[in-house]
Amino acid sequence: GSERTCCPVNWVEHERSCYWFSRSGKAWADADNYCRLEDAHLVVVTSWEEQKFVQHHIGPVNTWMGLHDQNGPWKWVDGTDYETGFKNWRPEQPDDWYGHGLGGGEDCAHFTDDGRWNDDVCQRPYRWVCETELDKASQEPPLL
């Protein structure tokens, strides 16, 4: 594949990554799949500046990110190390709350209205953000 040098139409560039901000809602797994089909992934927040950039674009709206603990420990969808990486949880979070009555706990992370993170039921239909790195090779076949 060829290296992507600029962001696709309707995506926003920031610090060598491209971002796409949804305006509708999906369950976390559906949002994750949507980004993968776009040769991207749910947003992975690695710095204070990226946090600020994303929260500016999403506004005070619950929005999925690429962080989950569906298999036990918290993991970023692109393999970024969770333990040593940037975190911005709300106080008392994540709490894997079972009291919502929807079955199970809370295994997927989202931005809240103040930008900080919360864990919630993965089936909730929240907005989402896709991210892809400009320097990574595109999956599209090269032009002949």
Partner: antibody, heavy 119, light 107 residues
Framework: QVQLVESGGGVVQPGRSLRLSCAAS????????MHWVRQAPGKGLEWVAV????????YYADSVKGRFTISRDNSKNTLYLQMNSLRAEDTAVYYC????????????WGQGTLVTVSS | DIQMTQSPSSLSAPVGDRVSITCRAS??????LNWYQQKPGKAPKLLID???NLQGGVPSRFSGSGSGTDFTLTISSLQPEDFATYYC?????????FGPGTKVDIK
């Protein structure tokens, strides 16, 4: 009402240490990040450090990195600034301030405590 | 680190005047720009955050605008209690740097 009261300032010799405290009341201290900001006599404001609500993350100004340590004790509703290897240019009024989560601005401030570094 | 500059460094204006203070960042800070007012011997007071969000209890004669690198604080009709020093601060990237301040006094 929100109240922040700094203490621990005073006169100290260059190279020595000092610990400032900031006692918080009127809000849930453990839910807020906190900042230290200083102001040298007759000069402008200089941001010093911030600490996450749970102490898990800390950031510092380059001028104090490696010498100052921000910490907190949520059980005592108290913020601290441990200042080591003090220099004359650290002479200032030190303010603690509460963080507004979305913007990282400082919405409530203490009255300040004066630190004078002099031989 | 992001450098913040303010202009003018001081200004004299009569009560009732419209005054503007500009703040410039050395790189794009989106809209993470805060304005503070400080009177002699007092702690700073937050007036505006995220460039244009007026804080509760702050008179509506204060307004903020701008994005990216260029920002403005405007006082539509200067009142006696507005004579003070005004600081901008970026909170996009640590360290959260302040501008050098603008002193507003009575003409």
């Amino acid at each position: 009402q929100v109240q922040l009261v700094e203490s621990g300032g005073g006169v100290v010799q260059p190279g020595r240490s000092l610990r400032l405290s900031c006692a918080a009341s009127g809000f849930t201290f453990s839910s807020y990040a906190m900042h230290w900001v200083r102001q040298a006599p007759g000069k402008g404001l200089e941001w010093v450090a911030v600490i996450w609500f749970d102490g898990s993350d800390k950031y510092y100004a380059d001028s104090v990195k490696g010498r100052f340590t921000i910490s907190r004790d949520n059980s005592k509703n108290t913020l601290y600034l441990q200042m080591n290897s003090l220099r004359a240019e650290d002479t200032a009024v030190y303010y603690c301030a509460r963080d507004r989560a979305y913007s990282s601005s400082s919405d409530y401030w203490g009255q300040g405590t004066l630190v004078t570094v002099s031989s | 680190d992001i450098q913040m500059t303010q202009s003018p460094s001081s200004l004299s204006a009569p009560v009732g005047d419209r005054v503007s203070i500009t703040c410039r960042a050395s790189q794009n800070i989106i809209n993470y720009l805060n304005w503070y007012q400080q009177k002699p011997g007092k702690a700073p007071k937050l007036l505006i955050d995220v460039a244009s969000n007026l804080q509760g209890g702050v008179p509506s004669r204060f307004s903020g605008s701008g994005s990216g690198t260029d920002f403005t604080l405007t006082i539509s009709s200067l009142q006696p209690e507005d004579f003070a020093t005004y600081y901008c601060q970026q909170s996009y990237s640590t360290p959260f740097t302040f501008g050098p301040g603008t002193k507003v006094d009575i003409k």
